[in-house]
């Protein structure tokens, strides 16, 4: 469940994503069959850099509310195509 995932991520809070945690998240998302808003909100809360793994097409469906807590350094590994999608959403999130 999402609550179980949150509890496991809480234990690793403040650390870089380890391969073990990456595997856990990957299996959880695949098990759900899609990346829904609740899951995305949870993942970005603990690992904001997760956004940089999403394609521009996937990012286009991310609501601004999911990225309001993301800092510029969290997007260090995003590419320009991703940032073109994220920056307008971030501006909208901050305005709200």
């Amino acid at each position: 469940s999402l609550e179980t995932l949150k509890a496991l991520l809480e234990v690793n809070k403040g650390h870089e994503m380890s391969p073990q945690v990456a595997t856990l998240i990957d299996r959880f998302v695949k098990g759900r069959g899609q990346l829904d808003k609740d899951t995305l909100d949870t993942l970005t809360a603990f690992y904001p850099g997760y956004l940089c793994s999403l394609s521009p097409e996937e990012l286009s469906s991310v609501p601004p509310s999911s990225i309001w807590a993301v800092r510029p350094q969290d997007l260090d590994t995003c590419d320009p195509r991703q940032l073109d999608v994220l920056y307008p959403k971030a501006r909208l999130a901050f305005q709200n």
């Epitope: 391969p19 073990q20 299996r27 690992y47 590994t77």
Partner: nanobody, 111 residues
């Protein structure tokens, strides 16, 4: 933390080809996608190519049609096939995945 190791760089003549590899620790690390960036001497870091979580790809205009990014999930490796290399492709090439960076591999294109 995730460990990324690049290889495959070297000295090549203009017009030649190279294939860079980036291998990650962690069984599903590359299923999150990965990117190649490069830094030429005296220049800012520049994005080269990406393969995303969903398997789609993206390229900077300067390499589109010449470079191809791909991944082998079984080997946990991302590749950058570089063809028709130009002098301006000379740089240190870095792989990144899940907010981790590799140490880089030098690519030098000579005339």
């Amino acid at each position: 933390q995730l460990q990324l190791v690049e290889s495959g760089g070297g000295l090549v003549q203009a017009g030649g080809s190279l294939r860079l590899s980036c291998t990650a620790s962690g069984s599903t690390s590359m299923s999150y996608g990965a990117k190649w960036f490069r830094r030429a001497p005296g220049k800012e870091r520049e994005w080269v190519a990406s393969v995303y979580r969903d398997g789609t790809t993206g390229y900077d205009d300067s390499v589109k049609g010449r470079f191809t990014i791909s991944r082998d999930l079984a080997k946990n490796t991302v590749y950058l096939q570089m063809n028709s290399l130009r002098l301006e492709d000379t740089a240190v090439y870095y792989c990144t995945a899940l907010n981790s960076w590799g140490q880089g591999t030098q690519v030098t294109v000579s005339s």
